[in-house]
């Protein structure tokens, strides 16, 4: 499946354009903000949807930081720039010339410098911690239930391989969903663990990116399942290279 | 309960097509994706492909070229349509459900036994 | 496509003993700590039936007799103790990589 051949919709990312236009009149849908054309029987790329959610800008938020080498998204949010995959550009700079180097999934990596500042590759984040705190229930839930319901969850609608999901922990009621995916693990077609991190966090929050799909219905074994926080850790192939002063703050 | 019951033609004319429907209950399709694996006298089991919940589907390299599934969501039914039917695709056909999302197959049809012959 | 290899295709065993069923890929099933390998039981005239789960988990309702063991390539079903019950043809299935693929079953007899 592409695009929604009968009405021309983009079943997966509702923040684009279609219109009949592609090959022997077939649907083809371009991301609002950068006009790329996307692949709708796939997730789109983070970069892209950034990209198409600065087009309507709303207001920053930040995230709490956490220690060691986890990033967390403090930025908030930005325009960045994509290449022409859709994937984030390593090197991202703002309209004051103020630039800094971002990983796989488009968090900051490094201090903020000038122009002369370089981002020799695009460091891939390999492992992403996605920290949950669930509203109180009668009783736990059960561990394997739940397991089986965030792994359908991210298999059915976000497509991602299940050897993607390398655990879910949890101890009630933080569950933690641990995503892992090595540049030598993921084959062409498989969909990356950033962009359905992303797709994730912004479903939680009740912003969906899919087209005329229900909000997130999470239950395990019948029992809602419904989410009160969310954090979210980076972890990069390439420790992050930030300065002491900042470290320390 | 899960349940997954399939219907279909016993018999198929070689170069024909073949056309199977997996009526479910207990769970909603709007939910869990449904499989299709065939079991042959000389081949042991194949997974032939899915349709998941979105309506998405994936199929085994091997049979894409005349391989079709899809759904009726409102009916509970997922339907299986395979074309140029050859005396080697003899087989058990069946649909299946995983539960744990590993990648296993939990649930499965009673199966549908095909025959490719003259 | 990863193969998966039952080396035997037919094994007798005494009623009470240990059968051990071995199933070998022709690489790696492992992702992250996790093996993607699973056990099925299967009688005549019926569908297969789960039994394990990612190499050593048991499904729901099948008895503590089966347990599952083996990393990357050697994965063991093992059965102790068999019972007349457990005449069937027993098959491994990975799902690391698509398409999903079974090995070619092992039939367990009773001697």
């Known amino acids: 499946h592409t695009a929604a051949q009968d009405n021309c919709t983009c079943p997966t990312n509702k923040m684009t354009v279609c219109s009949p236009d592609g090959p022997g009149g077939r649907c083809q849908c371009r991301a609002l903000g950068s006009g790329m054309a996307v692949d709708c029987s796939t997730l789109t790329s983070k970069c892209l949807l950034l990209k198409a959610r600065m087009s309507a800008p709303k207001n920053a938020r930040t995230l709490v930081r956490p220690s060691e080498h986890a990033l967390v998204d403090n930025d908030g949010l930005y325009d960045p720039d994509c290449d022409p995959e859709g994937r984030f550009k390593a090197r991202q700079c703002n309209q004051t010339s103020v630039c800094w180097c971002v990983n796989s999934v488009g968090v900051r990596r490094t201090d903020k410098g000038d122009l002369s500042l370089r981002c020799d590759e695009l460091v891939r984040t390999h492992h992403i911690l996605i920290d949950l705190r669930h509203r109180p229930t009668a009783g736990a839930f059960n561990h394997s239930d739940l397991d089986a319901e965030l792994r359908r969850l991210f298999r059915e609608r976000y497509r991602l391989h299940p050897k993607f999901v390398a655990a879910v922990h949890y101890e009630q009621p933080t569950i933690q969903i641990e995503l892992r995916q090595n540049t030598s693990q993921k084959a062409a077609g498989d969909v990356d663990i950033g962009d359905a991190a992303y797709y994730f966090e912004r479903d939680i929050k009740g912003e969906s990116l899919f087209q005329g799909r229900g909000g997130l219905d999470l239950r395990v074994r019948g029992e809602p399942l419904q989410v009160e926080r969310t954090l979210i850790y980076y972890l990069d192939e390439i420790p992050p290279k930030f300065s002491m002063k900042r470290l320390t703050a | 309960e899960v349940q997954l019951e399939q219907s279909g033609p016993g018999l198929v004319q070689p170069s024909q097509s073949l056309s199977i429907t997996c009526t479910v209950s207990?769970?909603?399709?709007?939910?869990?994706?449904v499989h299709w694996v065939r079991q042959s006298p000389g081949r042991s089991l194949e997974w032939l492909g899915v349709i998941w919940s979105g309506g998405n589907t994936d199929y085994n390299a091997a049979f894409i070229s005349r391989l079709t599934i899809t759904k009726d969501n409102s009916k509970s039914q997922v339907f299986f349509k395979m074309n140029s039917l050859q005396p080697n695709d003899t087989g058990v056909y069946y649909c299946?459900?995983?539960?744990?999302?590993?990648?296993?197959?939990?649930?499965w049809g009673q199966g549908t036994l095909v025959t490719v012959s003259a | 496509d990863i193969v998966l290899t039952q080396s035997t295709a037919s094994l007798a065993v005494s009623l009470g003993q240990r059968a051990t069923i071995s199933c070998r890929a022709s690489?790696?099933?492992?992702?992250?700590?996790?093996?993607?390998i699973h056990w099925y039981q299967q009688k005549p005239g019926q569908p297969p039936k789960l039994l394990i789960y990612r190499a050593s988990n048991l499904e729901s309702g099948i008895p503590a007799r089966f347990s599952g063991s083996g990393s990357r390539t050697d994965f063991t079903l093992t059965i102790n103790p068999v019972e007349a019950d457990d005449v069937a043809t027993y098959y491994c299935?990975?799902?690391?990589?698509?398409?999903?693929?079974f090995g070619g079953g092992t039939k367990l007899e009773i001697k």
């Open positions: 299946a459900r995983e539960d744990r999302y590993v990648g296993e197959f939990a649930y």
């Open positions: 690489e790696s099933v492992d992702s992250y700590g996790n093996s993607f």
């Open positions: 299935q990975q799902s690391n990589e698509d398409p999903r693929t």
């Open positions: 207990g769970f909603s399709l709007t939910r869990y994706g």
